[in-house]
C-alpha cells in the first residue's frame, strides 16, 4: 500500500527545537522568533513494525531531503544518525529496522524507540546546542519525551 | 521442524475465562512472534492478536476489553485468556508463527498448531 | 479495517479442472495477500505469500497473482487432494483480516 506521511516538527519536553547541525547531523536548543524557520521539518510516514496497541511504528525523514535517521552499532552501541537514500525507493511502506521506530504516547507526549535497539530512545540532553542521540535510559538526566506540531504540505 | 501445539480445556462455562497455551518448538520466541486465530464451528477465520518477540502485543479491537496473549521464553510457550466468555467464543483456537522477515513479510503467518476445540456451554 | 471480499463461496469441480478464485480489498494492500488451504480437521497451511510467492514445498500447480485491491488463486490442474477450502489473508496492516472462505466441492 502507498505508505501515508504527515509533516511535522519535534520539540523535546523542555522546548527544545530540532535543527541541523552539519549535513549529517541534528540538535536541539531553544528557537524563538523568527529562528523557529530554522528548525526541521520531518515527514513522518507510518510504516510496518511491530505494532502494537500501544506503539505505531513510523519513519522519520527530513522534509524534502533524501535523509532518515536511522539506528546502528558504532563501535558497539546503538547510536542515531542520518542516512542518506535513493529517494526513488524511499519512503516505502516496509521500511528496513534501522529505520523504524515506535512512537509511543503517553500522557500527551511522545517518545520514539528505536524497533532495531528496543529501549533505546530518541533522545536529547539538558543542555543547549547538543546533538540528538540515541539514549538506553528514560527518566533520568536526558529527555526522551517530546511533542509533535503538525506542518502543512 | 517448526511446531505449535495448543492445550487447554475443551469445555468452558460461560462468563469464565477460556485459558490456553501455546507450546512451540523449533523457534525462539524471542526472536518471532505468535498470533491466535479462532474459527467458530463450520465458519471462517478471525484473527485474534499476537504477541511479538519483544513481548508487545496487538489485540484485535472486537476482543481488547476481554484479552490477554502473554509469554514465557524460556518454556517457549504463548498463553492466551479470553474473559467472560459466551456461547459466541466456541470455535477451534489455533496458534501461528509470524514470518517476522522485516521490509517483506512482517505480519504474515507460515505454521499453524493444529488447533483445539473449546466449547462454551454451561 | 481492511475488508476482504473472497468469491466465489463454493465452487465444484472435477479433477484436471483450472479453477480460479479472486479476492478484493477495501483498500490498496500491494503485494500483501497469503493464500491459505485447509481440508476439514486441520489447519490452514500456507500455499502462497506476498501475492505470488509459492511455499516452499507446495506444488506448482498453485498460483497467485495480482497486487493493489484485485488478487486471484489459480490451480492449474485440480488433484484429488486440492478439494478443500481456500482462504486469503491480508497482511498489510492490522487487524489482519481474512477472507470468507472458498469451499472446493468435486463435481
Known amino acids: 500500500a502507498p505508505v501515508r506521511s504527515l509533516n511535522c516538527t519535534l520539540r523535546d519536553s523542555q522546548q527544545k527545537s530540532l535543527v541541523m547541525s552539519g549535513p549529517y547531523e541534528l540538535k536541539a536548543l531553544h528557537l524563538q522568533g523568527q529562528d523557529m524557520e530554522q528548525q526541521v521539518v520531518f515527514s513522518m510516514s507510518f510504516v510496518q513494525g511491530e505494532e502494537s496497541n500501544d506503539k505505531i511504528p513510523v519513519a522519520l525523514g527530513l522534509k524534502e531531503k533524501n535523509l532518515y535517521l536511522s539506528c546502528v552499532l558504532k563501535d558497539d552501541k546503538p547510536t542515531l544518525q542520518l542516512e542518506s537514500v535513493d529517494p526513488k525507493n524511499y519512503p516505502k511502506k516496509k521500511m528496513e529496522k534501522r529505520f523504524v521506530f515506535n512512537k509511543i504516547e503517553i500522557n500527551n507526549k511522545l517518545e520514539f524507540e528505536s524497533a532495531q535497539f528496543p529501549n533505546w530512545y530518541i533522545s536529547t540532553s539538558q543542555a543547549e546546542n547538543m546533538p540528538v542521540f540515541l539514549g538506553g535510559t528514560k527518566g533520568g538526566q536526558d529527555i526522551t519525551d517530546f511533542t509533535m506540531q503538525f506542518v502543512s504540505s | 521442524e517448526v511446531q505449535l501445539q495448543e492445550s487447554g480445556p475443551g469445555l468452558v462455562k460461560p462468563s469464565e475465562t477460556l485459558s490456553l497455551t501455546c507450546t512451540v518448538s523449533g523457534f525462539s520466541l524471542s526472536e518471532f512472534g505468535v498470533s491466535w486465530i479462532r474459527q467458530p464451528p463450520g465458519k471462517g477465520l478471525e484473527w485474534i492478536g499476537l504477541i511479538w518477540g519483544g513481548g508487545d502485543t496487538y489485540y484485535n479491537s472486537p476482543l481488547k476489553s476481554r484479552l490477554t496473549i502473554s509469554k514465557d521464553n524460556s518454556k517457549s510457550q504463548v498463553s492466551l485468556k479470553l474473559s467472560s466468555v459466551t456461547a459466541a467464543d466456541t470455535a477451534v483456537y489455533y496458534c501461528?508463527?509470524?514470518?517476522?522477515?522485516?521490509?517483506?513479510?512482517?505480519?504474515?503467518?507460515?505454521?499453524w498448531g493444529q488447533g483445539t476445540l473449546v466449547t462454551v456451554s454451561s | 479495517d481492511i475488508q476482504m471480499t473472497q468469491s466465489p463461496s463454493s465452487l465444484s469441480a472435477s479433477v484436471g479442472d483450472r479453477v480460479t478464485i479472486t479476492c478484493q480489498t477495501s483498500q490498496d494492500i500491494d503485494m500483501d495477500l497469503n493464500w491459505y488451504q485447509q481440508k476439514p480437521g486441520k489447519a490452514p497451511k500456507l500455499l502462497i505469500s506476498q501475492g505470488s510467492t509459492l511455499w516452499p514445498g507446495v506444488p506448482s500447480r498453485f498460483s497467485g497473482s495480482g497486487s493493489g485491491t484485485d488478487f486471484t488463486f489459480t490451480i492449474s490442474s485440480l488433484q484429488p487432494e486440492d478439494f478443500a477450502t481456500y482462504y486469503c489473508?491480508?497482511?498489510?496492516?492490522?487487524?489482519?483480516?481474512f477472507g470468507q472462505g472458498t469451499k472446493l466441492e468435486i463435481k
Open positions: 501461528a508463527k509470524q514470518r517476522n522477515l522485516w521490509a517483506y513479510d512482517l505480519y504474515g503467518m507460515d505454521y
Open positions: 489473508l491480508q497482511t498489510d496492516s492490522f487487524p489482519l483480516t
